[in-house]
């Protein structure tokens, strides 16, 4: 489950912030299991960009469909 904060409850994003995401801070090096952490600026929270073959909010699950597809390609 990749839940989001209710944006309506938060103030508008500061005008100075232009990018949609930032690098996560060093404190979040272990936030994503198999992927890269990105800080979503407007939602003001970290998120994970999964490496190929992984899915889930934290890239914690192997993508079985990708595994099957890869093994079929080999055949």
């Amino acid at each position: 489950e990749n839940s989001t904060s209710p944006l309506s409850a938060d103030p508008p994003v500061a005008a100075a912030v232009v990018s949609h995401f930032n690098d996560c801070p060093d404190s979040h090096t272990q936030f994503c299991f198999h992927g890269t952490c990105r800080f979503l600026v407007q939602e003001d929270k970290p998120a994970c960009v999964c490496a190929s073959g992984y899915v889930g909010a934290r890239c914690e699950h192997a993508d079985l469909l990708a595994v099957v597809a890869a093994s079929q390609k080999k055949q």
């Epitope: 989001t4 500061a14 930032n22 801070p25 979040h28 600026v41 003001d44 970290p46 934290r58």
Partner: antibody, heavy 115, light 106 residues
Framework: VQLQQSGAELVRPGASVKLSCTAS????????MHWMKQRPEQGLEWIGR????????KYAPKFQDKATITADTSSNTAYLQLSSLTSEDTAVYYC?????????WGQGTTLTVSS | IQMTQSSSSLSVSLGDRVTITCKAS??????LAWYQQKPGNAPRLLIS???NLKTGVPSRFSGSASGKDYTLSITSLQTEDVATYYC?????????FGGGTKLEIK
């Protein structure tokens, strides 16, 4: 959108206590939750943090044997348990979650350790 | 990561422009917050991300960043601004705080 902490505690030396921090308006699974300590007339110290999504914790070395941080995602609540209490643990304890644009702190829980 | 607030106290007058500085020992990439604390009260978050003013905080407060140096400015000091101000880095754990700068009226 806020963090609501449990009420003040008066406990005996040697006892344990469990403080709570309940989030409203956001899901605690979205990011780490942190705990801080502030002794009377002193600065702020970081105790540790939890990743509520999986229970992974990290502590400052000086609190490793003193504090245990847990979380219950069904109630959107983080907890700080302090054990073997002494007068040195008398302080105000705060929970927090910080972002780039916004940050949230609880109002603090005053813990007094006294016989 | 060490956070150094060079002045532990500042003697100021009402209406003054006040600048409080904080230096990080390494680059923290603007993952910095400023807090105001009055005796007996919880810290009040003023600014996160070095420059983002929290909702409800008066616009006389502002934050800026240059390299490892961070500044909190108050354009025209009011009576209610007399307090201790702390900076905090949250780039990495352990989170660390400056020693605080106490504003005192001349």
């Amino acid at each position: 959108v806020q963090l609501q902490q449990s009420g003040a505690e008066l406990v005996r030396p040697g006892a344990s206590v469990k403080l709570s921090c309940t989030a409203s308006g956001f899901n605690i699974k979205d990011d780490y939750m942190h705990w801080m300590k502030q002794r009377p007339e002193q600065g702020l110290e970081w105790i540790g943090r939890i990743d509520p999504a999986n229970g992974n914790t990290k502590y400052a070395p000086k609190f490793q044997d003193k504090a245990t941080i847990t979380a219950d995602t069904s109630s959107n609540t983080a907890y700080l348990q302090l054990s073997s209490l002494t007068s040195e643990d008398t302080a105000v304890y705060y929970c927090s979650r910080m972002g780039l644009l916004r940050g949230y702190w609880g109002q603090g829980t005053t813990l007094t350790v006294s016989s | 990561i060490q956070m150094t607030q060079s002045s532990s106290s500042l003697s100021v007058s009402l209406g003054d422009r006040v600048t409080i500085t904080c230096k990080a020992s390494v680059h923290i990439n603007s993952w910095l917050a400023w807090y105001q604390q009055k005796p007996g009260n919880a810290p009040r978050l003023l600014i996160s991300g070095a420059t983002n003013l929290k909702t409800g905080v008066p616009s006389r407060f502002s934050g800026s960043a240059s390299g490892k140096d961070y500044t909190l400015s108050i354009t025209s000091l009011q009576t209610e601004d007399v307090a201790t101000y702390y900076c905090q880095q949250y780039w990495d754990t352990p989170w660390t705080f400056g020693g605080g700068t106490k504003l005192e009226i001349k």
